[in-house]
């Protein structure tokens, strides 16, 4: 269960693959695409707005966190529309909706080395977002091994990683070498 | 389907002013960025001014900047240009334009301008 | 200001395929759209994002980018392409088009 219905924190962050391809977002009123390549030098970089929850789980599942508790986040590109996991097509799919969002919209968050996160399926333990022929898909990570693994890592930049201590405590970070890499920074948008 | 109707347009004297009117219609007027664009008699297109999500997110190009602005009235799914301080070379169609995709947080007009309205015409003349 | 240069004009013949160029500076560091105007009609977006087309925009329509010229270019050209083509692009919030160049099939 989610701990509260209101987010932690929010803050807007524009969001790149592990090779540094930008993630484009375009939509339209009865379709989308999700466009991962590399952007264009004078093109400016969409941004998604990132809450942050706090979760209760069995301490003996993964994710950033101790005694049990895990940062969950969701992700919107824009105003009422929020990335799902399609866990039956393996896929990642945008979809319109009112609060309460659904279990699909929620992803484990993972700080991952060099300064990079992966996001997990909640509805899906084991199951990442990833990046596969050029789109966002779901990809199932069989080991811990693997949980570093390139098509998984996403970068988030025009953030300052340090904002995750006041969320969570630099102390609950498992890596120390990570702590030295993340400086989240807050943003506020209004809508 | 998408249609955006121009109105407002019409005769006006040097100095005079107009308001334009764009009644849109067939998507969520609200998530899509918008724009005028003009075309004066014989020439080719001239972005005028565009509008994001709210009225701090105004753009202008340069020859109309402090008589012309544009607003937007979600409510009404509206998009208008006030234009004032008329001068001749303002005569054109102009049209409303609705940018492809729908707005990002990352702010501003999203290009490429995926619909256009059948325009209405501007005539400055004494 | 940012400028696009256009040919004021372009011929060929049906069946032929046309080439219409957009000139800017550093214009591969942007994306080009490309709009289709007939005569006593709305522009139509024809090519989006470089290389991309809308739907209802048949196949013959193809576009490129790179280094400072963007290009429409336009394989087996019917008698109904005929029209007027504009590029254009977004430069730091601000619509940026050519002068536009007057398409006629032969």
């Known amino acids: 269960s989610i701990t509260g219905i209101s987010p932690i924190t929010e803050y807007l962050a524009s969001l790149s693959t592990y090779n540094d391809q930008s993630i484009t977002f375009a939509l339209e009123d009865e379709s989308y695409e999700i466009y991962v390549e590399d952007l264009k030098k004078d093109e400016k970089k969409d941004k998604v707005l990132l809450s942050y929850y706090e979760s209760q789980h069995p301490s003996n599942e993964s994710g950033d966190g101790v005694d049990g508790k895990m940062l969950m986040v969701t992700l919107s590109p824009t105003k009422d529309f929020w990335l799902h996991a399609n866990n039956k097509e393996h896929s990642v799919e945008l979809h319109k909706c009112e609060k309460p969002l659904p279990d699909q919209a929620f992803f484990v968050l993972h700080n991952m080395h060099s300064n990079c996160v992966s996001f997990e399926c909640k509805t899906d333990p084991g199951v990442f977002i990833g990046v596969k022929d050029n789109h966002l898909a779901l990809i199932k990570v069989d080991s811990s091994e693997n949980l570093c693994t390139e098509n998984i890592l996403f970068k988030l930049s025009e953030t300052n990683p340090a904002f995750l201590y006041k969320v969570v405590g630099a102390a609950d970070y498992k890596d120390d070498d990570d702590k030295a890499a993340h400086h989240h920074h807050h943003h506020h948008h209004h809508h | 389907e998408v249609q955006l109707l121009e109105s407002g347009g019409g005769l006006v004297q040097p100095g005079g002013s107009l308001r334009l009117s764009c009644a849109a219609s067939g998507f969520t007027f609200s998530s899509y960025a918008m724009s005028w664009v003009r075309q004066a008699p014989g020439k080719g297109l001239e972005w005028v001014s565009g509008i994001a999500d709210d009225f701090t997110s105004t753009y202008y190009a340069d020859p109309v900047k402090g008589r012309f602005t544009i607003s937007r009235d979600n409510s009404k799914n509206t998009l208008y240009l006030q234009m004032n301080s008329l001068r001749a070379e303002d005569t054109a169609v102009y049209y409303c334009?609705?940018?492809?995709?729908?707005?990002?947080?990352?702010?501003?007009?999203?290009?490429?301008?995926?619909?256009w309205g059948q325009g209405t015409m501007v005539t400055v003349s004494s | 200001s940012y400028v696009l240069t256009q040919p004021p004009s372009v011929s060929v013949s049906p069946g032929q395929t046309a080439s219409i160029t957009c000139s800017g500076e550093r214009m591969g560091d942007k994306y080009a759209a490309w709009y289709q105007q007939k005569p006593g009609q709305s522009p139509v977006l024809v090519i989006y994002r470089d290389t991309k087309r809308p739907s209802g925009i048949p196949e013959r329509f193809s576009g490129s980018n790179s280094g400072n010229t963007a290009t429409l270019t336009i394989s087996g050209t019917q008698a109904m392409d005929e029209a007027d083509y504009y590029c254009g692009v977004l430069k730091q919030d601000t619509g940026v088009f050519g002068g536009g160049t007057k398409l006629t099939v032969l």
């Open positions: 334009a609705r940018d492809l995709w729908m707005m990002n947080y990352a702010g501003g007009l999203r290009y490429p301008f995926g619909y």
